[in-house]
């Protein structure tokens, strides 16, 4: 009996035309939502003039439906038992699941001022930038709509720069009508224990963002894992959102719509400094902001963002060192709300429910040459927003799962 079930599972989780796995893999049957909370800055003038702590107040959720588009350019390679694809990006605003509209205004860090002053270091260039910031009436902070902040707007200061610079900025710009990949993953035909594991991303086995093992593309994309998952396993996966591979460990047994699943969570150790977790030494890319690699809980992904000083963390700086959150008032981290988890059905390896939580922050530094940053007396890693991307298997699919998979075993 068990052998027959194993054989059936092995057959059905292969990523090829005709299997249950393939149908759900090409286009997810689960509705996936991405909720945003924006950190509205309450005291912009005090920060700019006196280098005060930044007082933030989160506003949200603002909810978008995402991951509703089918994978594109799906191509099987029989020779190396892989399947390659592009994952198209799309987001549809859901007013009924949101506290306001895409036209709501927020006071946030001026993305262009923070990024340009960080990247363009030449003394003469900084003088030009300063005059253009003043000319465009730009400042350290700005008021932007949700739509502008997320999806992009033409920046008035960058538009005056007399060089071919990027003049449109936004935290997720460009997004709609773009795609992530090309991913090339093992289809499991020759070896089921490799199914869904990424072979290459954008044609390479490494990212070129990090040194040593930190640069590796490990595991799957977290939508599924090879079947027969054990509680003792460390599940590796790659997330292009955070420009790195990461891992999850077993936390607890959960009953999801009558289906026994394993809850795997991202442990605090994954965000620790190299002092506590030596494996993380290669995620420390510079010495000053990281206080000689002793800070933890923030990841500098600037190399992955064309040099823009983007730092990824967990929401509200959960699992981050006190020095990171000290200059920010109004944060309340808690595990239940702000950690990431995956609920995995162990027989198939399918992720039936997940909550992926992350925060996007931008570094802003004092600058002698740039007037609006002149009074700053310290560096700030400024929270802009945090997001919660969730998906749960639908009732119909859960019934099918219970009858065809878990029901047959129990």
């Amino acid at each position: 009996g068990d052998l027959l079930i194993q054989k059936t599972i092995k057959k059905q989780v292969v990523l090829e035309e005709g299997t249950i796995a393939f149908k759900n893999w090409v286009k997810t049957g689960t509705e996936v939502y991405r909720q945003f909370w924006i950190f509205d800055v309450q005291n912009p003038q005090e920060v700019m003039m006196n280098s005060s702590n930044i007082q933030v107040k989160q506003r949200g959720p603002y909810t978008y439906r995402v991951r509703f588009l089918a994978k594109e350019n799906v191509t099987q390679d029989a020779e190396d038992n892989t399947v390659s694809f592009l994952q198209p990006n799309g987001a549809i605003f859901e007013p009924s699941l949101s506290v306001g509209t895409e036209a709501d205004n927020f006071t946030v860090l001026n993305l262009a001022v923070a990024a340009a002053s960080h990247i363009y270091q030449n003394q003469f260039v900084q003088m030009i930038l300063n005059s253009l910031i003043n000319k465009s009436k730009s400042s350290m902070f700005q008021v932007r709509t949700l739509r502008e902040l997320l999806w992009g707007y033409r920046d008035p200061f960058l538009s005056l720069v007399p060089y071919p610079v990027t003049t449109t900025v936004g935290l997720f710009y460009p997004y709609n009508n773009t795609a992530d990949g090309v991913y090339k993953v093992f289809n499991g035909k020759d070896n089921i224990s490799k199914v869904a594991i990424i072979d290459t991303y954008k044609g390479k086995r490494n990212l070129s963002y990090w040194e040593s093992h930190c640069d590796m593309i490990n595991g799957t994309d977290a939508a599924s894992f090879p079947p027969f998952v054990e509680k003792s396993q460390v599940l590796q996966f790659f997330s292009s959102d955070i420009c790195r591979s990461i891992y999850a460990v077993f936390e607890s047994d959960v009953n999801l719509k009558g289906i026994p699943v394993y809850r795997f969570v991202l442990p605090s150790k994954a965000f620790a400094s190299p002092v506590e977790n030596p494996d993380n030494y290669c995620f420390c890319t510079e010495k000053i902001i990281s206080k000689n690699c002793t800070s933890y809980g923030v990841l500098d992904i600037s190399k992955c963002k064309e040099g823009r000083p983007v730092y990824i963390s967990l929401p509200h700086f959960l699992y981050a060192s006190p020095d990171v959150s000290e200059p920010i008032d109004g944060l309340n981290p808690n595990e239940e709300e702000h950690r990431t988890y995956l609920d995995i059905e162990p027989i198939t390896g399918f992720t039936l429910q997940f909550a992926k939580r992350l925060q996007v922050n931008l570094l802003v530094k004092p600058s002698e040459k740039i007037q609006v940053l002149k009074n700053l007396k310290r560096n700030y890693i400024v929270p802009i927003l945090w997001l919660n991307e969730t998906g749960t298997i639908g009732d119909e699919k859960a019934n099918m799962f219970r009858s065809q998979v878990t029901g047959k075993i129990n």
């Epitope: 990247i119 270091q121 260039v125 007399p162 060089y163 610079v165 990027t166």
Partner: nanobody
Framework: QVQLQESGGGLVQPGGSLRLSCTAS????????MSWYRQAPGKERELVAA????????YYVDSVKGRFSISRDNAKNTVYLQMNSLKPEDTAVYYC?????????????WGQGTQVTVSS
């Protein structure tokens, strides 16, 4: 590859003149802002004069205004610094710099420097 070659430095008496030249190769000269910096022993490198790629608003540090003049000849891929009424405090190594911006990148190139000594 990119090269910036300074020339024209030397020893000059106070009140004298020198004309520094910097000839560029390996990049599109007309797309770059060109600057002259100087560094005196034990001091930080200082921006002396700069001219944008289009020859627009020229910058001079206060201490050289009215004495130094920067110009560029895009046909010859060369930037000049005419230095008049030289003072002992102008003694330094003078460096040529080329910079442009493209996308989110800054392309910043430096010459090896030429020594200017103002002494009687």
């Amino acid at each position: 590859q990119v090269q910036l070659q300074e020339s024209g430095g030397g020893l000059v008496q106070p009140g004298g003149s020198l004309r520094l030249s910097c000839t560029a190769s390996g990049f599109t000269f007309s797309s770059y802002a060109m600057s002259w910096y100087r560094q005196a022993p034990g001091k930080e490198r200082e921006l002396v004069a700069a001219i944008p790629h289009d020859g627009g608003s020229i910058y001079y540090v206060d201490s050289v205004k009215g004495r130094f003049s920067i110009s560029r000849d895009n046909a010859k891929n060369t930037v000049y610094l005419q230095m008049n009424s030289l003072k002992p405090e102008d003694t330094a190594v003078y460096y040529c710099n080329a910079v442009t911006l493209q996308g989110w990148r800054e392309y910043d190139y430096w010459g090896q420097g030429t020594q200017v000594t103002v002494s009687s």
